[in-house]
């Protein structure tokens, strides 16, 4: 004969646990139903009646099967330097992230505590390491034969175009200018962009000083103060 299915509430066998989506009520000493996500326990179970669940009120939520007497409050509205990437619903909390072009300069358990604009590399400097959700852009001077003529948090240094005859040689912030109608080979058809920040955890690294134009002018050095950040300008 098939084993009889117990309906909640029921007394568990000695030494056994309640089933999935059930909890043991200490007062009733019975296995009782949990409430589904988006609900909470309005009335706890007794020996003869199961848990009575009710929907979460506006601006409150439960994300898991539960038997909490009250739903959790959704977080405050996103700060003005953040955007809402997940709305508050009955089943999930609001999630705020730094707005595009910004990164999380200080993370806390509840989310991002402080957002800051991504550093922009000035002309003559390109992105050496792109920004992420939790780390700033790192800039580097354009090496000989490459240039960047933009103030950007995404543009890298691009190769100078190759000319049959050079009218004006290229430098770190300007492409070469050719005298002929067209260069023999253009190495730089257009600006090269790095992808926008992706979600990665920042490590406790010590980047070398790189010039930048952003508000975030921070570099960890092994010893003492840094030299002037050449070519660093405002936005």
């Amino acid at each position: 004969l098939p084993a009889q299915v117990a309906f909640t509430p029921y007394a568990p066998e000695p030494g056994s646990t309640c089933r999935l989506r059930e909890y043991y009520d200490q007062t009733a000493q019975m296995c009782c139903s949990k409430c589904s996500p988006g609900q909470h326990a309005k009335v706890f179970c007794t020996k003869t009646s199961d848990t009575v669940c009710d929907s979460c009120e506006d601006s409150t939520y439960t994300q898991l099967w539960n038997w909490v007497p009250e739903c959790l409050s959704c977080g405050s509205r996103c700060s003005s330097d953040q955007v809402e990437t997940q709305a508050c619903t009955r089943e999930q909390n609001r999630i705020c992230t730094c707005r595009p072009g910004w990164y999380c300069a200080l993370s806390k358990q509840e989310g991002c505590r402080l957002c800051a604009p991504l550093r922009k590399c000035r002309p003559g400097f390109g992105v050496a390491r792109p920004g992420t959700e939790t780390s700033d852009v790192v800039c580097k001077p354009c090496a000989p034969g490459t240039f960047s003529n933009t103030t950007s948090s995404t543009d890298i240094c691009r190769p100078h175009q190759i000319c049959n005859v050079v009218a004006i040689p290229g430098n770190a912030s300007m492409d070469a200018v050719c005298t002929s109608t067209s260069p023999t080979r253009s190495m730089a058809p257009g600006a090269v962009h790095l992808p926008q920040p992706v979600s990665t955890r920042s490590q406790h690294t010590q980047p070398t000083p790189e010039p930048s134009t952003a508000p975030s002018t921070s570099f960890l050095l092994p010893m003492g103060p840094s030299p002037p950040a050449e070519g660093s300008t405002g936005d």
Partner: antibody, heavy 116, light 112 residues
Framework: QVQLVQSGAEVKKPGASVTVSCKAS????????IIWVRQAPGQGLEWMGW????????NSAQKLQDRVTMTTDTSTSTAYMELRSLRSDDTAVYYC?????????WGQGTLVTVSS | DIVMTQTPLSSPVTLGQPASISCRSS???????????LSWLQQRPGQPPRLLIY???SRFSGVPDRFSGSGAGTDFTLKISRVEAEDVGVYYC?????????FGRGTKLEIK
């Protein structure tokens, strides 16, 4: 006890650079940020910037961002603030303070005088 | 940027009497984490600033209980229940909810 001790007074010519140091003791340096604030003679407090002693993330006031560099050296629990291309209106007492949620401990201040 | 407006700019008070300083922010200081990062600093003549109140109403250690902070959103108040001679100085409100951190212009407390 928590202490922030700053470097001594400086007299600089216009166009020069100055570096102010802020040595922390009495707490784990890398678990807090450091802010830099300045106060011109007879004026109020002006926020210059903040740096994380943990990962070097930072932010500075827009009007200063092309002239200021903040650094930290975790091996000596010291924060540094360098201000370049000094002008006479940069004459001020420069303070470091601990924190980001609030600023609970302050350095004694460093007077920087810019004069030709 | 969030602008912090303090009133009054100067406050002459009698010893033993209460004093009140108001601070208004140009936008809400409630962070998405639920905290309001509004602090009050005291600066006595010739000294560095000193933290009195943080997160609107929490008194920092060692601060006398005659100092209290209140408010929410954009309107905040620092109260001194009975002014003492050592309270003379300039009081600043400051927000650290978001960059750039900003200070009020300060309120000078002086004895009548």
């Amino acid at each position: 006890q928590v202490q922030l001790v700053q470097s001594g007074a400086e007299v600089k010519k216009p166009g020069a650079s100055v570096t102010v140091s802020c040595k922390a003791s009495g707490y784990t340096f890398s678990t807090y940020g450091i802010i830099w604030v300045r106060q011109a003679p007879g004026q109020g407090l002006e926020w210059m910037g903040w740096i994380s002693a943990f990962n070097s993330n930072a932010n500075s006031a827009q009007k200063l961002q092309d002239r200021v560099t903040m650094t930290t050296d975790t091996s000596t629990s010291t924060a540094y603030m360098e201000l370049r291309s000094l002008r006479s209106d940069d004459t001020a007492v420069y303070y470091c303070a601990r924190g980001e949620d609030f600023f609970d401990y302050w350095g004694q201040g460093t007077l920087v005088t810019v004069s030709s | 940027d969030i602008v912090m407006t303090q009133t009054p700019l100067s406050s002459p008070v009698t010893l033993g009497q209460p004093a009140s300083i108001s601070c208004r922010s140009s936008q809400s200081l409630v962070h998405s984490d639920g905290n309001t990062y509004l602090s009050w600093l005291q600066q006595r003549p010739g000294q560095p600033p000193r933290l009195l109140i943080y997160k609107v109403s929490s008194r920092f250690s060692g601060v006398p209980d005659r100092f209290s902070g209140s408010g929410a959103g954009t309107d905040f108040t620092l109260k001194i229940s009975r002014v003492e001679a050592e309270d003379v100085g300039v009081y600043y409100c400051t927000q650290s909810t978001q960059f750039p951190f900003t200070f009020g212009r300060g309120t000078k407390l002086e004895i009548k």
